[in-house]
Each structure stands twice: as C-alpha cells, then as structure tokens.
Amino acid sequence: ASTGETPNLGEVVVAEVGWDALKLNWTAPEGAYEYFFIQVQEADTVEAAQNLTVPGGLRSTDLPGLKAATHYTITIRGVTQDFSTTPLSVEVLTASGLNDIFEAQKIEWHEGTHHHHHH
C-alpha cells in the first residue's frame, strides 16, 4: 500500500438536474486516484444510500434512478491503494416534473481538510 499523502479532491458541482437524474462534476488532481466512490443518500430517510464508482480518469458522471422533487446528499471520495480522501458533499433537490429541468440547484458543498488513512 502507498504510504504517501493522498491529495484531497477539489470541488464538486451538480451541473444538471432533472426529475429522475442529475449530472455530477468534480475536480481532482490528474492521475491521483484509481476510482471515485460516490454515495447518493436521500435526505431524511433511513433508506440505504445508492453506491457507485467511477474510474479515476473521469471528472463527471450521470446519476440516474432518482426520485422527483427529492432532496439528496451526494458524497464523493477519491480512492487509491488502501487510501480514501476525506469525503466531499453536495446537497441537491431534484426537479418536480418531466418539464422542470434546470441548471444546477446546488444547495451547498463542503469538504474536509485531511485525507483518511484506512487501517
């Protein structure tokens, strides 16, 4: 396993919002991660988060299969060789209907300042 510092992610932005899907963009150092681990959690519910991963070379992904007019918290981490970054989160409200598709309604995003070393 790598013993070097794992660089943190930059910023995460919801680029497009639809009624049942959205597009997530983020920034990260080139070549730093094997993949990104993304969790999509419906707010105010005990339902399990939707988990997915994206290859480390990508900086955006579509997130399908969401509910209309629903608040979600989306968390992203960069992962490489036994390391994971501090999670970066964004909250979003999906559109209320088929025709109500609009540019990013990003409520907030926040990041930690240290990487996590998993033992």
Epitope: L52, P64, V79, D82
Partner: antibody, heavy 121, light 107 residues
Framework: QVQLVQSGAEVKKPGSSVKVSCKAS????????ISWVRQAPGQGLEWMGG????????NYAQKFQGRVTITADKSTSTAYMELSSLRSEDTAVYYC??????????????WGQGTTVTVSS | DIQMTQSPSSLSASVGDRVTITCRAS??????LGWYQQKPGKAPKRLIY???SLQSGVPSRFSGGGSGTEFTLTISSLQPEDFATYYC?????????FGQGTKVEIK
C-alpha cells in the same frame, strides 16, 4: 496475478446458516470490491451482494436482504458471505468475484473456484 | 433493485449465423453493462464491458451496443465454441443485477 481461493463444500440442514470465505492474494485487497454470485443447479447467475473492504459497508440484492451478511477482514485479505435460514432452494455453487464496474476497473475479472453448498434434511 | 430482462431465454442457431441477444433495464442505467459467456461447470468469462468495449483476447465477432435501458450482444458469425449461455450484468448502480441468461444451442 490475483487469486481468489474459497473455502470447501458444505452440507447444511434447513434453517441453519453457512459462512463461506474468499481469500484474495496477489494484489491490493482493501480498495477493490468483492461480489458474491450464486448459481443453483441448471439455473442462472444471481448477484447476491458485494463489499468494498476499505469502506466496510456492503450492498445486497433485495432478494437476499436480511438473510445474507457480507464482511471483509482487511488484515487477512479475506471476504466472507454468511447466509442464514437456509432452505433447499439455497443449494447452489457460490462464487466470490472481482467484477469490472464497481470499485474495480482492471483488465480481467477474477473468480473464486466456487463453493458448493447443499441444503438437505 | 434494477431488473435486467434478457431475451430470448434460449435460441437455436447454426454455425455462421448472426445472433443478437438483448438486455433491457427496468430504469436508465449508467453504461456499466457487461456481457459474460459461461460454459457448463466453468466460471463466467467477460466478453464485453462498458456496453461496447471488447475484452482483450475475445474474438472480434463479438460486439456490444446500446445505452440507457436497452443493450445488445451480437455474434456476427457463430462458431462451434460459441455454443454456451450468455448473461448481461449491470454493475454501475448497486445492487448489481444479472440478466436471466440466454442459452445458445446448436440447431
């Protein structure tokens, strides 16, 4: 070269539990997902669940929710699948696998040799 | 869970035939869709990943296509060694799901 080596065949009584192990060697264990897939005699492949050891939390297919528990021990590079309340329909070959698309983007998929679980009274 | 409906469940074909197998997802999925070939008593073997990328070492007669909810595996000219069972797997959204399988038999 990654190898996934599973525990041996099991014969179980209905209502009991079985725990199958899958030891990984030849590569990083913690950051790559391990899935469990089963195949009953003459039937298709069923994805049961999977885990990324570095995060610890597992995903389960709805069909097995509440009856299956998938865990991973990073210190021994071993994943486990425990299935409870066994019935005859659970008689199958159980595979652990590293499958492309979720926390793994390697050139090849890797499969364990399979563990036959027979449920019979 | 996302349902993957695979069709047909079985088909009979001759050597040299063009064969197409379809997988339909119950909702839009990311294109993390793989196709696997399985022969009796063996573990499955990946043929296609990311819906259309050919696995290294797999003959070019195999091809994949589709996006969103509908995906296809095509064998352009069936060979004797291709008689097997084929499965699709969506592994882009958890929990992952296999299709029910398509058994390709000799006519």
């Amino acid at each position: 070269q990654v190898q996934l080596v599973q525990s041996g065949a099991e014969v179980k009584k209905p209502g009991s539990s079985v725990k199958v192990s899958c030891k990984a060697s030849g590569g990083t264990f913690s950051s790559y997902a391990i899935s469990w897939v089963r195949q009953a005699p003459g039937q298709g492949l069923e994805w049961m669940g999977g885990i990324i050891p570095i995060f610890g939390t597992a995903n389960y297919a709805q069909k097995f929710q509440g009856r299956v528990t998938i865990t991973a021990d990073k210190s021994t590079s071993t994943a486990y699948m425990e299935l409870s309340s066994l019935r005859s329909e659970d008689t199958a070959v159980y595979y652990c696998a590293r499958l492309y698309g979720y926390a793994y983007y390697g050139a090849f998929d890797y499969w364990g040799q399979g563990t036959t679980v027979t449920v019979s009274s | 869970d996302i349902q993957m409906t695979q069709s047909p469940s079985s088909l009979s074909a001759s050597v040299g035939d063009r064969v197409t197998i379809t997988c339909r997802a119950s909702q839009g999925i990311r294109n993390v869709l793989g196709w696997y070939q399985q022969k009796p008593g063996k573990a499955p073997k990946r043929l296609i990943y990311d819906s259309s990328s050919l696995q290294s070492g797999v003959p070019s007669r195999f091809s994949g296509g589709g996006s969103g909810t509908e995906f296809t595996l095509t064998i352009s000219s069936l060979q004797p060694e291709d008689f097997a069972t084929y499965y699709c797997l969506q592994n882009g959204l958890q929990p992952a799901t296999f299709g029910q399988g398509t058994k390709v038999e000799i006519k």
